[in-house]
């Protein structure tokens, strides 16, 4: 559910044209001849966290030493890249880039908010869609699963395209595409439920283009702590957008008196944002801010990258853990508002939904909780990790593991509390989601630590694919299916409607515990994998002949 595909996409890959690549090779030779192993040539050999004042680059992948900054244009300074590039290269002007970077990051983050707002507006009006189209629970699960499946398949494709073509054009086209499809889907006649399913699939493709490419642009616009900050803002757009999706869905349908209008809000905002991206986002080169970006050309084949990633145990286990998070967030996001509505029917504080609008209050509250817990989760997760790093090198995966295991307890308690107290259930949701969401930013850092920059785009795409495949691609459908299965062997009653869905959702805490175990497994290999990645980065700074990746 919650954009784990973009949680680690911070770095770019190859340059845009072969000519640029050729110029770069010539430049590297010249720089080495001049004795330059500064920012334009290679990074220093210092490990993470070992630096003199002013010579440390803080990226999501840790701290790497670089040569002290001198006057622009001299070897060993950030400015020398422009000088060395020669007249043929088109380097963005630092001044204009500096002015526009903040606006660009803000627009990209806004676009991410809209991606998720659009996705979860459907969840916010799910009951109404079910009522209008005559959709059964299995059909409602299918809607979300089709979206995630298409997203999952499209993400690696856009990751590939994003490394080779104009990224902001792909981004804008993606936004315009999903906006048009979502807007059109609000007019689908009752008899064409399959058209609604198809439209969600197409929206998934459109949104995949954004989620895979936007973080790499942010990664190229900023460096040091600023990059971490900007990516955190970008990630916070996920819970914010998801929460706003629920809120928009339920409040717009209430105001307009028809659920169709809820699907017309995000497309209008999407068109505006797409246009702003074309205007305000600068056409940065890949690896612009991270000075190694120019040197760290992808030198290995895609197949070799994949083999290396599969052998990277920290990466594999953290990817499996993100799949568990994805499974739980996808299922809970889809079914919890309906579950709470049924709980109130059992408690006789609400009536069975006979005609739309249905369960608006639950979607609204759940949306607000998702918003706030997303923010709280990112902040507490990052804070806890920063504190724990003083105690142990394995802080990142351990904080994630504790968060997951703690979350599982509170997710279990939701189903206990819901039987007697909706307020109690909401409190459990609040704590459970906060703990679950606390690992977002940290998971990004883990990937950056253990994967070398030239493989990060591939790593992000593969992690995106697996987290969706094993996670939220099937979980909403699976929960609906299990709920139906239980209900078929019980008598018809509001109590069993509530219980069957609750029993089905009980699968989530078990998967979350499994995810916690995967994070603990990550902790076992994290230090050695991180050291290996740093060693390889240092090797990449040497002449190509000596590079063994």
């Amino acid at each position: 559910m919650m954009c784990l595909e973009c949680a680690s996409a911070a770095a770019g890959g190859a340059e845009e044209e072969e000519a640029d690549a050729e110029r770069r090779r010539r430049r590297r030779g010249a720089q080495r001849g001049a004795g330059g192993s500064g920012c334009c040539g290679a990074r220093g050999a210092g490990g993470a966290g070992v630096s003199a004042a002013g010579d440390e680059v803080q990226t999501l992948s840790g701290s790497v030493r670089r040569a002290p900054t001198g006057p622009p244009g001299t070897p060993g300074t950030p400015g020398c890249a422009a000088t060395a590039k020669g007249p043929g290269a088109q380097q963005p002007k630092p001044a204009s880039l500096g002015r526009g970077r903040g606006a660009a990051a803000a627009i990209l983050s806004l676009g991410n908010v809209l991606n998720y707002l659009d996705r979860y507006t459907v969840a916010g009006v799910l009951l109404d869609i079910q009522q209008h189209f005559g959709v059964k629970d299995r059909g409602a699960g299918l809607l979300q699963s089709v979206f995630i499946c298409s997203f999952m398949v499209a993400a690696p494709i856009f990751g590939y395209l994003g490394d080779r073509f104009n990224r902001k054009v792909i981004l804008s086209c993606g936004i315009f595409f999903w906006s048009a499809v979502t807007f059109s889907s609000s007019f689908i006649p009752q008899q064409y439920f399959w058209l609604l399913v198809l439209s969600r699939g197409l929206v998934g493709i459109g949104e995949a283009s954004y989620s895979t490419i936007a973080p790499t642009i942010i990664g190229d616009l900023f460096t040091k702590n600023t990059r971490t900050l900007m990516l955190s803002v970008f990630y916070f757009a996920i819970p914010l957008g998801s929460g706003l999706g629920y809120i928009t869905g339920s409040s717009v349908k209430q105001a307009a008196g028809a659920w169709h209008w809820a699907l017309r809000v995000s497309p209008v905002l999407g068109m505006i944002t797409g246009t702003l991206i074309l205007i305000l986002v600068p056409a940065t080169k890949r690896g612009h801010a991270d000075q190694l970006g120019d040197q760290l050309k992808a030198r290995t084949s895609w197949l070799r990258d994949m083999k290396a990633l599969i052998r990277n145990r920290s990466y594999v286990f953290s990817s499996l853990a993100t799949s568990a998070v994805s499974f739980a967030t996808g299922a809970l996001g889809m079914w919890i508002p309906l579950y709470l509505h049924r709980a109130q029917v059992v408690q006789k504080t609400a009536e069975t939904c006979n005609s739309p609008p249905c369960g608006a209050k639950d979607s609204l509250i759940f949306g607000a909780i998702t918003c706030f817990t997303g923010f709280l989760g990112v902040v507490t997760g990052a804070g806890a990790t920063r504190w724990c790093r003083l105690k142990t090198q394995r802080a990142d995966p351990l904080v994630c593991a504790v968060g997951m295991l703690g979350s599982a307890i509170f997710i279990c308690l939701i189903f206990v509390a819901a039987k007697s107290s909706i307020v109690g259930a909401y409190i459990c949701i609040f704590v459970g989601e906060t703990l679950l969401f606390s690992n977002w930013a940290i998971t990004a850092d883990i990937l950056m630590y253990v994967v070398i920059p030239t493989r990060r785009a591939t790593a992000v795409a593969l992690q995106s694919f697996t987290s969706h495949l094993l996670g939220d691609a099937g979980s909403p459908y699976l929960i609906g299916f299990i709920s139906d299965l239980i209900r078929q062997s019980t008598k018809d009653s509001p109590l069993w409607e509530f219980l069957s869905l609750g029993y089905a959702l009980m699968l989530c805490p078990f998967v979350v515990v499994l995810g916690g175990m995967f994070f603990l497994a990550t902790a076992l290999f994290f230090v050695s994998d991180r050291a290996r990645a740093e060693q390889q980065v240092n090797q990449l700074a040497m002449p190509p002949a000596s590079v063994k990746v």
């Epitope: 079910q130 005559g134 299918l142 007019f187 006649p189 009752q190 439920f193 939904c353 209900r487």
Partner: antibody, heavy 125, light 107 residues
């Protein structure tokens, strides 16, 4: 062949109760939405109640005119749908039809693709 | 509730003629309209679903059209067995409602 057979009609006094039954065959009943539609003598058709399948929480919907007095239910093991009518009024006098909604596995149509032969309910003092 | 109005209430035609029966909704309902035929002393049967989609076993002379608020049921060259009452029904929103019917009679 799809078959819907209604039973349980008759003459009753205002304020009394009656339970209509509809036996079905020829299709997968447990996956199908069912409705009752009535027709007063010489008048048009009026939808009364709808019951969805278990995959839709066996949710029931009612017309405003009968809400609180009539209850629709189903027994998947017997492939039967029922209409429990309480506090009957003169204006409830009608032929009651058991109807089936067309099913598409993931969703269902709200229209009626098959109708029973109908059962007469007369409410009179 | 969505109110359906059918016109004319009664239509007198001679066999072989082609006729159009109208159904108007009180608000836009896209194509969520369905047509039923009820012969004397018989149960209704589905003729057309979703304004224009034909039903298996229904003669091809029956066709439907329209979208939004105005809908038409057309019978091309009326046959003797077509003389009956025709109802439209909306499924756009609950409660499900029927039109008052149009009676097609022999001229």
């Amino acid at each position: 062949e799809v078959q819907l057979v209604e039973t349980g009609g008759g003459l009753v006094r205002p304020g009394s109760s009656l339970k209509l039954s509809c036996a079905t065959s020829g299709f997968t009943f447990s996956d199908t939405w069912m409705s009752w539609v009535r027709q007063a003598p010489g008048k048009g058709l009026e939808w009364v109640a709808l019951i969805k399948d278990k995959n839709s929480n066996s949710e029931a919907n009612y017309a405003e005119s009968i809400k609180g007095r009539f209850t629709i239910s189903r027994d998947d093991s017997k492939s039967r749908v029922y209409l429990q009518m309480n506090t009957l009024r003169d204006q409830d006098t009608a032929t009651y039809y058991c109807t089936r909604h067309e099913d598409f596995y993931y969703y269902s149509g709200y229209y009626f693709d098959y109708w029973g032969q109908g059962v007469m309910v007369t409410v009179s003092s | 509730d969505i109110v359906l109005t059918q016109s004319p209430p009664t239509l007198s035609v001679t066999p072989g003629e082609s006729v159009s029966l109208s159904c108007r909704a009180s608000q836009g309902i896209s194509t969520s309209i369905h047509w039923y035929q009820q012969r004397s002393n018989e149960s209704p049967r589905l003729l057309i679903k979703y304004a224009s989609q034909s039903i298996a076993g229904i003669p091809s002379r029956f066709s439907g059209s329209g979208s939004g608020t105005d809908f038409i049921l057309s019978i091309n060259r009326v046959e003797s067995e077509d003389f009956s009452v025709y109802y439209c029904q909306q499924t756009y929103s609950l409660p499900l409602t029927f039109g008052p019917g149009t009676k097609l009679e022999v001229k």
